[in-house]
């Protein structure tokens, strides 16, 4: 969490941003909130990016003002116009690119004063893993697959019954480059598994951590998966 204050003494407002991550090829959100104003026409929102000459986005007098927008963001940005009046200056970024990573500044002007806060935005690829029983293998085997990751993640298997066990000797992980030549498909196979035990396939890079769980019993297969973004710090 980054909380910034205006520099002009008593004419400062609090602006808050949250460090976040974008999944390349998908839409992302750069979060920013501020002390709201009564009149929309008195609010100016400017998004800037370190190292970029033009603006990322500008919103003033109740509408977008994109005449000074940098070429790399053309047609890809939007604020939540109906939420600006309640203090939401978050930016929606369409079709996130690797090059969108960096330090952004959310700069706000209202009738109460000015304020800004920086935001670290990471970009990469992350996806939910799916763990399935591999019927083609000669022994009891599980297969964990996740379609899109970047940078290359680590894959670790764990089990509820054998907590703390190292499964690296009985697992095999491969990374296959996807057609766009950036992201990779992750496939990990775990051998010699037993029933009535929950196995977890954990995939992690510096952007996200995802886990797929599976439990095989005589009567059913239970699956669960979840994904969490790392380093979501507010400023």
């Amino acid at each position: 969490l980054i909380i910034g204050f205006g520099i002009s003494g008593r004419h400062s407002i609090t602006v808050t941003t949250v460090a976040s991550a974008g999944n390349i090829g998908e839409d992302g959100i750069l979060s920013c909130t501020f002390e709201p104003d009564i009149k929309l026409s008195d609010i100016v929102i400017q998004w800037l990016k370190e190292g970029v000459l033009g603006l990322v986005h500008e919103f003033k007098e109740g509408k977008d003002e994109l005449s000074e927008q940098d070429e790399m963001f053309r047609g890809r940005t939007a604020v939540f116009a109906d939420q600006v009046i309640v203090g939401n200056a978050s930016l929606r970024l369409k079709n996130v690119q690797l090059t969108d990573a960096g330090t952004y500044k959310c700069y706000i002007i209202t009738s109460k004063g000015k304020g800004n806060a920086n935001l670290e935005y990471k970009t990469g690829a992350f996806s939910m893993p799916e763990v399935n029983v591999d019927y083609n293998a000669s022994s009891e085997t599980l297969r964990c697959e996740a379609p899109r990751w970047f940078p290359q993640p680590t894959v670790v298997w764990a089990s509820q019954v054998d907590q703390g066990a190292n499964f690296s000797e009985v697992s095999n992980t491969s990374f296959e480059l996807n057609s766009e030549n950036v992201t990779m498909k992750v496939v990990s196979v775990l051998y010699n598994v037993t029933i009535n035990n929950t196995y977890s396939c954990m995939i992690e890079n510096d952007i996200a951590k995802a886990t797929g769980d599976i439990k095989v019993t005589e009567s059913e297969i239970k699956r669960r998966s979840h994904l969490q973004l790392l380093n979501s710090k507010a400023s």
Epitope: E140, V216, S219
Partner: nanobody, 122 residues
Framework: EVQLVESGGGLVQPGGSLRLSCAAS????????MHWVRQVPGKGREWVSR????????SYEDSVKGRFTISRDNAKNTVYLQMHGLRAEDTAVYYC???????????????WGQGTLVTVSS
């Protein structure tokens, strides 16, 4: 309550054929892989074959490959084992059982019918 009822066994000469049936009830048949397991009197149980819930995937123990065919009729909640080219070493009590996956360690199976005896002898 899970019920599995095997039938179709009998005495057959070497090289002969038999078709075993297993009628299942008490569970959602289409959720389960079905397996055939056999037990030679006085010996342990041995896995023979398996079939996936939709019938698209089958697998066999090496000694019966090319001679036995597993199939299922999901409308009738029944699994079959067609046996050709029977040999004396195929003599056993044949059981069908169910499991959530295609895994087939004998100790995983919990539900058993009464079995049907196949005797291959001249």
């Amino acid at each position: 309550e899970v019920q599995l009822v095997e039938s179709g066994g009998g005495l057959v000469q070497p090289g002969g054929s038999l078709r075993l049936s297993c009628a299942a009830s008490g569970f959602t048949f289409t959720d389960f892989w079905m397996h055939w397991v056999r037990q030679v009197p006085g010996k342990g149980r041995e896995w023979v074959s398996r079939i996936s819930p939709d019938g698209s995937s089958t697998s066999y123990e090496d000694s019966v490959k090319g001679r036995f065919t597993i199939s299922r009729d999901n409308a009738k909640n029944t699994v079959y084992l067609q046996m050709h080219g029977l040999r004396a070493e195929d003599t056993a009590v044949y059981y069908c059982t169910r499991f959530s996956t295609g895994w087939h360690r004998i100790e995983y199976f919990q539900h058993w019918g009464q079995g049907t005896l196949v005797t291959v002898s001249s």
